[in-house]
Amino acid sequence: MSGLGRSRRGGRSRVDQEERFPQGLWTGVAMRSCPEEQYWDPLLGTCMSCKTICNHQSQRTCAAFCRSLSCRKEQGKFYDHLLRDCISCASICGQHPKQCAYFCENKLRSPVNLPPELRRQRSGEVENNSDNSGRYQGLEHRGSEASPALPGLKLSADQVALVYST
């Protein structure tokens, strides 16, 4: 046993008392030692919330989390965890994930604001050559295994939770 020393440079039950920190929620990123929304603090020797540093230093392990946090602050946008990109809900209304439900449903109530292809869809026209056609198909299942970014890609329950977390 030792310690740090001279620097050359300047009433509950036993079960209730015991706190568990299960090692779950690990992402597939390079065998991380901390969950995705946390970073390793080498001085404290523990995982800390990325939220505390998003506005300050650049911490590469928090880059995706901080991007998703700032994206969520922007109205009408959501963060796609698979694409690791901030997506505008306006571009995918009609085939949108639940994160865009509020935005898109409000949009649909005022057709004047809709892009032409969606106005045609509402009036019964079919648009076969839309760039967004099928891009988010399967999302109406809300929590199905389908990936919002990659149709047909099967995800584990953990990955689904991650993709749909807001």
């Epitope: 046993m1 706190e19 020797g45 523990t46």
Partner: antibody
């Protein structure tokens, strides 16, 4: 005086589980993370993971995921590590250590775990 | 993971002489102006003891004959003058990235 007192040696059968303890004293328990390190006979040291009584942060070596679970009892300033599905590969001395300012400055005396039928 | 390579694997030095152990990291362990490299001494049947932390700072109760140097990826532990009690295994360990990793160890003996 800072002390980390570990539970005694364990002789267990393959496939069984074992829970070893590390009772701390002499400092404010919530101010430091407690880490666990494995040392197989005559070999180097391997970090298993840590547990922070303060913020619940639990850094963990993916190699030991599914093998080790760390828990803490704040009321007794004790940290536990449970090892499950034991095999001969898990026979080793396991140390707990207090982490501060980027280093493990105080260590427990070690707990020997022997897996044998 | 950051890999730490220690050299030599074993070392025999005469009493009163200088013992130098090296540790090379696979990537820099510098962190905001400090190097997160630590050195431990271990004697048979005992837990590791922190002798140097953050590359060049002495652990509590560690004699002044122990010193550490280096930054980035290359680090050294020096013991001078060597005493009988200094025999044992020495390990370097980095804290910068998780998982923290250890070197393979250097066995120090008296010649």
């Amino acid at each position: 005086e800072v002390q980390l007192q570990q539970s005694g040696p364990e002789l267990v059968k393959p496939g069984a589980s074992v829970k070893i303890s590390c009772k701390t004293s002499g400092y404010t328990f919530t101010e430091s993370t407690i880490h666990w390190v494995k040392q197989s006979h005559g070999k180097s040291l391997e970090w298993i993971g840590g547990i922070s009584p303060n913020n619940g942060g639990s850094p963990f070596n993916q190699k030991f995921k599914g093998k080790a679970t760390l828990t803490v009892d704040k009321s007794s300033s004790t940290v536990y590590m449970e090892l499950r599905s034991l095999s001969s590969e898990d026979s080793a001395v396991y140390y707990c250590a207090k982490w501060v300012r980027g280093a493990m400055d105080f260590w427990g005396q070690g707990t020997s775990v022997t897996v044998s039928s | 993971d950051i890999v730490l390579t220690q050299s030599p694997a074993s070392l025999a030095v005469s009493l009163g002489q200088r013992a130098t152990i090296s540790c090379r990291a696979s990537e820099s362990v510098d962190y905001y102006g400090m190097s997160l490299m630590n050195w431990f001494q271990q004697k048979p049947g005992q837990p590791p003891k922190l002798v140097i932390y953050a590359a060049s700072n002495q652990g509590s109760g560690v004699p002044a004959r122990f010193s550490g140097s280096g930054s980035g990826t290359d680090f050294r532990l020096n013991i001078h003058p060597l005493e009988e009690d200094d025999t044992g295994m020495y390990f370097c360990q980095q804290s910068k990235e998780a998982p923290p990793t250890f070197g393979g160890g250097t066995k120090l003996e008296i010649k």
